[in-house]
């Protein structure tokens, strides 16, 4: 039986590979029973968490992995030196900076190891799941009377990620959003003097290096303009 | 914040040398690919050389024998060497840097306006 996974992170040829013994048609044995998917996340490429859901299994189970990078220069099979735990039982495994190799197809491995049988197999694209961090140093400075230039920072080569701007005034209720590219600048041509303004970014790790789905977090907040509190019922809301 | 700054540009004759130096801040340098592009007027940019963070270096054909990449980790800067130099290497020269095993695994067109502001080098015969 080989099933292939549709995961939620953009790598559509993630198979996975369960491996059946031999059995009554009537009975189902251990080794049968599918194994978590496992989920793995790059941080801003300083390390990898990949991680699985452990309450899924019908007994508490460590669970081990094991990973290699497919025909590439380290395609040996490495035993995870890390594990991550929820409630005392293997949940995950982090992989340090040195052990990413973005560019190269990472294949990850999920067994039990009291039934060696039952294990699954997937290949990931390690580029697709970069998460940087958020944007820093947020900073705002006026171009012109009615015109703001918004500026921010980001841990990891510029070229490499895409931002989506998110700003709103006291009065509105709901945010408008503008994508960015690289150059991480953005302007908003007309702004209104009497009104208070709430700028926020989130950055991804596409298109130029890699192709990615998830946003990092979002920025902390930075505000322009004068605090109308006073007459807007919406602003609290706004903060909170 | 991250910055490639290009220096090292000028004018020379044909036959001569210069060595460009790009001096990189904001990111971890020793954990990257780093790179020269150029770009003549009216061109595309074009990949000149590349050297990976574990020392492995491409040249384009154009430049092989002629150029030479380098880097030093401690000074966070990489070099190119440029040897024997031809009119036709009159160009804007660029330092990119990308994310380890870019070069090696992936690849794609970039554009030279990614990165700094580039250094000129003018060639005349």
């Known amino acids: 039986l080989n099933t292939t996974i549709l995961t939620p992170n953009g790598n559509e040829d993630a198979t996975t590979d369960f491996f059946l013994t031999s059995m009554p048609t009537d009975s189902l044995s251990v080794s049968t029973l599918p194994l978590p998917e496992v989920q793995c996340f790059v941080f801003n490429v300083e390390y990898m968490n990949c991680t699985w859901n452990s309450s899924s299994e019908p007994q508490p189970t460590n669970l081990t992995l094991h990973y290699w990078y497919k025909n590439s220069d380290n395609d040996k099979v490495q035993k995870c030196s890390h594990y991550l735990f929820s409630e005392e039982i293997t949940s995950g495994c982090q992989l340090q900076k040195k052990e990413i190799h973005l560019y190269q197809t990472f294949v990850v491995q999920l067994q039990d190891p009291r039934e060696p049988r039952r294990q699954a197999t997937q290949m990931l694209k390690l580029q697709n799941l970069v998460i940087p961090w958020a944007p820093e140093n947020l900073t705002l400075r006026k171009l012109s009377e009615s015109q703001l230039e918004l500026n921010w920072n980001n841990r990891f080569l510029n070229h490499c990620l895409e931002h989506l701007v998110q700003y709103r005034t006291d009065w509105d209720h709901s945010w408008t959003e503008q994508s960015v590219d690289y150059r991480h600048k953005f302007s908003l041509p007309s702004v209104d003097g009497q009104k208070r303004y709430t700028f926020r970014v989130r950055s991804r790790f596409n298109p130029l290096c890699g192709s990615a789905q998830h946003w990092s977090e979002w920025s902390h907040p930075i505000h322009w303009g004068s605090n109308s509190s006073k007459e807007n019922p919406f602003l609290f809301a706004l903060e909170a | 914040q991250v910055q490639l700054q290009e220096s090292g540009g000028g004018s020379v004759q044909a036959g001569g040398s210069l060595r460009l130096s790009c001096t990189a801040s904001?990111?971890?340098?020793?954990?990257?690919?780093m790179g020269w592009y150029r770009q003549a007027p009216g061109n595309e940019c074009e990949l000149v050389s590349t050297i990976s963070s574990d020392g492995s270096t491409y040249y384009a054909d154009s430049v092989k024998g002629r150029f030479t990449i380098s880097q030093d980790n401690a000074k966070n800067t990489v070099y190119l060497q440029m040897n024997s130099l031809k009119p036709e290497d009159t160009a804007v020269y660029y330092c990119?840097?990308?994310?380890?095993?870019?070069?090696?695994?992936?690849?794609?067109?970039?554009?030279?306006?990614?990165w700094g502001q580039g250094t000129q080098v003018t060639v005349s015969s």
């Open positions: 990119a840097a990308e994310p380890r095993g870019y070069y090696s695994n992936y690849g794609g067109r970039r554009e030279c306006n990614y």
């Open positions: 904001g990111f971890t340098f020793d954990d990257s690919d």
